[in-house]
Amino acid sequence: ASNFDCCLGYTDRILHPKFIVGFTRQLANEGCDINAIIFHTKKKLSVCANPKQTWVKYIVRLLSKKVKNM
């Protein structure tokens, strides 16, 4: 659900963190219409997720901690 590298909507699925290698934050005030977390998967897919949802917050914190510990 993205266009010109902007997410236009969110996935309906809950992704397991074991499939995710990183993420990018999309901010609505920086040229895109909505705030989003773009998850990057092991299969080189980009998935747009709602940053307000609990499962997304957990994965963002998990990945952020991994980067800090590297």
Epitope: I14, H16, P17, N35, P51, K52, Q53, T54, W55, K57, Y58, I59, V60, R61, L62, S64
Partner: antibody, heavy 120, light 110 residues
Framework: EVQLVESGAEVKKPGSSVKVSCKAS????????ISWVRQAPGQGLEWMGG????????NYAQKFQGRVTITADESTSTAYMELSSLGSEDTAVYYC?????????????WGKGTLVTVSS | QSVLTQPPSVSAAPGQKVTISCSGS????????VSWYQQHPGKAPKLMIY???KRPSGVPDRFSGSKSGNSASLDISGLQSEDEADYYC???????????FGTGTKLTVL
């Protein structure tokens, strides 16, 4: 009707650990996270951390990092919170609460709470 | 130390309306939804409002929530004696990656 049933009251010595359980009676954890919240006598609510059982991934509040361990057993729909190096300031009621994975962190179902008393 | 600030106490007579405020910052209330919890003495908290202004089933429509910028409010109209309780606001904080509760407000129905 789903209920969160917590283990019974505990009295612990300073420096020891306590492990509190929380079972989803009449339901499962499949689309929920479980948070742990404590309340010292006469004080406010304090989020300690939470876990998404289907992920096996826990988040901890910075204040409790390194001292709290939250786990879950999907097969029995039971979550656990273990707090170590107990001090008198850890005397509190410990609640487990449920939040939808697709919601925005609202805790829509709570256990009745487990009183943990730390005393020498 | 919570970064969501509420007045320690509010009071009003039965039938009146009361507003409880909750002040935060961009990283919590400003960017996330707010929920409100009611707690009677010796009881577990109960969700009263979520997603700023939605009510779970069973919560009377006398309870309503709103948000403006980095602050949120809980309005209780037509006060009843059973509304006397502690009320807590809460929101996720993106900077801390933690769920925050407000300092709590004791509502007294005079």
């Amino acid at each position: 009707e789903v209920q969160l049933v917590e283990s019974g009251a505990e009295v612990k010595k300073p420096g020891s650990s306590v492990k509190v359980s929380c079972k989803a009676s009449g339901g499962t954890f499949s689309s929920y996270a479980i948070s742990w919240v404590r309340q010292a006598p006469g004080q406010g609510l304090e989020w300690m951390g939470g876990i998404i059982p289907i992920f096996g991934t826990a988040n901890y509040a910075q204040k409790f990092q390194g001292r709290v361990t939250i786990t879950a057993d999907e097969s029995t729909s039971t979550a656990y919170m273990e707090l170590s190096s107990l001090g008198s300031e850890d005397t509190a009621v410990y609640y487990c609460a449920r939040e939808s994975l697709t919601g925005d962190s609202e805790l829509d179902l709570w256990g009745k709470g487990t009183l943990v008393t730390v005393s020498s | 130390q919570s970064v969501l600030t509420q007045p320690p106490s509010v009071s009003a007579a039965p039938g009146q309306k009361v507003t409880i405020s909750c002040s935060g910052s961009t990283s919590n209330i400003g960017n996330n939804y707010v929920s409100w919890y009611q707690q009677h003495p010796g009881k577990a908290p109960k969700l009263m409002i979520y997603d700023v202004s939605k009510r779970p089933s069973g919560v009377p429509d006398r309870f309503s929530g709103s948000k403006s910028g980095n602050s949120a409010s809980l309005d209780i109209s037509g006060l009843q004696s059973e509304d006397e309780a502690d009320y807590y606001c809460a929101a996720w904080d993106d900077s801390l990656s933690e769920f925050l509760f407000g300092t709590g407000t004791k509502l007294t129905v005079l």
